[in-house]
Amino acid sequence: VPLSRTVRCTCISISNQPVNPRSLEKLEIIPASQFCPRVEIIATMKKKGEKRCLNPESKAIKNLLKAVSKERSKRSP
């Protein structure tokens, strides 16, 4: 599992494999913070529940982040 135990970033290594949404169960988005300077995308895979860190610079993830932030702004009080 490419997760670190430090108080800094959660992801040690990032998968550059193209994302097929069908292989994913869920995605967790951890925004950049004082602990980690970059946004982190942790995918839980359907098979075996393995966790994988995805590349936030990939086109697919950039589109996802845009969609999520759009949803967020719609629901903000």
Epitope: V19, K26, N63, E71, R72, R75
Partner: antibody
Framework: QVQLVESGGGVVQPGRSLRLSCAAS????????ITWIRDPPGKGLEWIGE????????FYAQKFQGQVTISADKSISTAYLQWSSLKASDTAMYYC???????????????????????????WGQGTLVTVSS | QSVLTQPPSASGTPGQRVTISCSGS????????VNWYQELPGAAPQLLIY???QRPSGIPDRFSGSKSGTSGSLVISGLQSEDEADYYC???????????FGGGTKLTVL
């Protein structure tokens, strides 16, 4: 009312280009995958490929890779299936269908989540017939 | 030739119970769920069964599905004349990285 409406079919000469449209209404377009299926005369259903508007990426059946392009315009909730050069063997009824669901939750926390479920193609368009003939 | 194997035809009389089989492999049905679609003459297909045995709302409980190993089954009990249609099974195939269908079964109500 949740629906998909295809358009753009008709009689086309071999070698010509064509773009089919699939207009969605009654649901949040970017929260689902849109799949294209064809039903050639006398044969069974064939999966062409799908697009996930939330990710902006398309996947294709090996048979159709490089032969067609699937795209989407989120601003008008419409998916497209495009050919640059049609063949007689492309003659079929073409359907778009709604597939995988992408639920965004915990939006107001510091860790939003996207949960993904593929529970079958639950909404289909009426179909559009493409006849490739000279 | 289809990746999933279905009998090309099936038949039954009104009130009878009919089973349609769908045979696959470890890369599709063996590791993914089975869906069933009904295609009535002149109409678009509709989802009949998803996740092996779940019925979408509006589908009568005469239709049921199951999965065992690398095969799926659709059972129609209390057959009615309006059930005359083509039935397709479908699954995801991890090797082909795509959705796969059976060749379809034409159901005739005698």
């Amino acid at each position: 009312q949740v629906q998909l409406v295809e358009s753009g079919g008709g009689v086309v000469q071999p070698g010509r280009s064509l773009r089919l449209s699939c207009a969605a209404s009654g649901f949040t377009f970017s929260s689902f995958s849109i799949t294209w299926i064809r039903d050639p005369p006398g044969k069974g259903l064939e999966w062409i490929g799908e697009i996930t508007p939330m990710f902006g990426i398309a996947f294709y059946a090996q048979k159709f890779q490089g032969q067609v392009t699937i795209s989407a315009d989120k601003s008008i909730s419409t998916a497209y299936l495009q050919w640059s050069s049609l063949k007689a063997s492309d003659t079929a009824m073409y359907y778009c269908a709604r597939d995988g669901r992408f639920d965004v939750s915990d939006l107001l926390t510091d860790k939003p989540k996207v949960t993904i479920n593929y529970n079958g193609m639950d909404v289909w368009g009426q179909g559009t017939l493409v006849t490739v003939s000279s | 030739q289809s990746v999933l194997t279905q009998p090309p035809s099936a038949s039954g009389t009104p009130g009878q119970r009919v089973t349609i089989s769908c045979s696959g492999s470890s890369s599709n049905i063996g590791s993914n769920t089975v869906n069933w679609y009904q295609e009535l003459p002149g109409a678009a297909p509709q989802l009949l069964i998803y996740n092996n045995d779940q019925r979408p709302s509006g589908i009568p409980d005469r239709f049921s599905g199951s999965k065992s190993g690398t095969s799926g089954s659709l059972v129609i009990s209390g057959l009615q004349s309006e059930d005359e249609a083509d039935y397709y099974c479908a699954s995801w195939d991890d090797s082909l990285n795509g959705r796969v269908f059976g060749g379809g079964t034409k159901l005739t109500v005698l």
